[in-house]
Interface confidence: medium
């Protein structure tokens, strides 16, 4: 039985050219994480595996940075990187849990950040 | 074009040493995980171990079977690939290919350079 | 550690013909698993990765499938530079394991 939840950033905006943290944080299940892939509409653009390390998809070498934890850093925002983007947490024994965040990138310099939270 | 091209292959006694090479052209090295994999005659590809790309510090993972005998590193100013075999034995006999890895799936392959280990 | 095991070890199939290959792992591994062709004295080809995503270059008679723990590899109107050794490989974790192969020769 999967008890786990997905707790995400939600709906985040930045500004245009800036850099953004896509963060979710797996709880309420014992599972072990045993690989996390970040995808944005059905393009892959990273993943980390727990006995692999990190891989980026060579398209988005130059703006996709690994990390903070099992994050996901992307720089120099456009227009274009407005969309939806998931966390796709693999787990044992429970399977599959996927969240969900939608940035927004804004050209206006006024870009108000989504909640964050610190993943412990 | 994309290529690897391995050398260094050769007859060694058992309990000998010898370092493979893999040169590396038409891509940018440093973003790849770069492996070695190994076949022993007429048996099945066996993954021996691959060293990260800049992202992840080069660092380096090894299957159990070469794990404390053989060392991989690469040299990225050359864009070579090695593999630094010690204390061979006769079960190490094998053609030898480094292989680039993309999320772990090996996308390209060298031509294979071969080891025969006998006395 | 996961162990692919791939059948049949051996087929012989005519050209024109249609042949699948199947390759089990021994843990759930989602859609990690890649598919290679090797034709003698030659070095391996990636035809398939994540299960079913053809790799460039490679032919739609090739299509791959499955997920979990089950997966399988078809070759449509087989063409005579098709025979050769096929190995499947997980790429979900450390080590990564290919299955033992499956020699396809003319019939």
């Known amino acids: 039985m999967m008890t786990g939840t997905i707790e995400t950033t939600g709906n985040i905006s930045a500004e245009k050219g800036g850099s953004i943290i896509l963060q979710c944080h797996l709880s309420s299940t014992t599972a072990q994480v045993t690989q996390v892939n970040w995808e944005q509409q059905d393009q892959l653009l990273a993943i980390c595996n727990a006995d692999l390390g990190w891989h980026i998809s060579p398209s988005f070498k130059d703006r996709v940075a690994p990390g903070p934890g099992l994050g996901l850093t992307l720089q120099s925002l456009t227009v274009n990187d407005t969309g939806e983007y998931f966390c796709i947490y693999h787990t044992y024994p429970d399977g599959t849990y996927t969240g969900r965040i939608f940035l927004e990138v804004l050209e206006s310099s006024v870009a108000e950040h989504g909640a964050r939270f610190q993943i412990p | 074009d994309v290529q690897l091209v391995e050398s260094g292959g050769g007859l060694v006694q058992p309990g000998g040493s010898l370092s493979l090479s893999c040169a590396a052209s038409?891509?940018?090295?440093?973003?790849?995980?770069m492996n070695w994999v190994r076949q022993p005659p007429g048996k099945a590809l066996e993954w021996l171990g691959f060293i990260r790309n800049k992202a992840n510090g080069y660092t380096t993972e090894y299957s159990a079977s070469v794990k404390g005998r053989f060392t991989i590193s690469r040299d990225n100013s050359q864009s070579i690939l090695y593999l630094q075999m010690n204390a061979l034995r006769a079960e190490d006999s094998a053609t030898y290919y480094c292989?680039?890895?993309?999320?772990?799936?090996?996308?390209?392959w060298g031509t294979g350079t071969t080891l025969t280990v006998s006395s | 550690d996961i162990q692919m095991t791939q059948s049949p070890a051996s087929l012989s199939a005519s050209v024109g013909g249609t042949v699948t290959i199947t390759c089990r792992a021994s843990e759930h591994i989602y859609s990690y698993l890649a598919w290679y062709q090797q034709k003698q004295g030659k070095s391996p080809q990636l035809l398939v990765y994540?299960?079913?995503t053809l790799a460039e270059g490679v032919p739609s008679r090739f299509s791959g499938s499955g997920s979990g723990t089950q997966f399988s590899l078809k070759i449509n109107s087989l063409q005579p530079k098709d025979f050769g050794s096929y190995y499947c490989q997980h790429h979900y974790g450390n080590p990564l394991t290919f299955g033992a192969g499956t020699k396809l020769e003319l019939k």
């Open positions: 994540n299960a079913k």
């Open positions: 292989a680039r890895s993309t999320a772990w799936y090996f996308d390209v």
């Open positions: 038409g891509f940018t090295f440093t973003d790849y995980y």
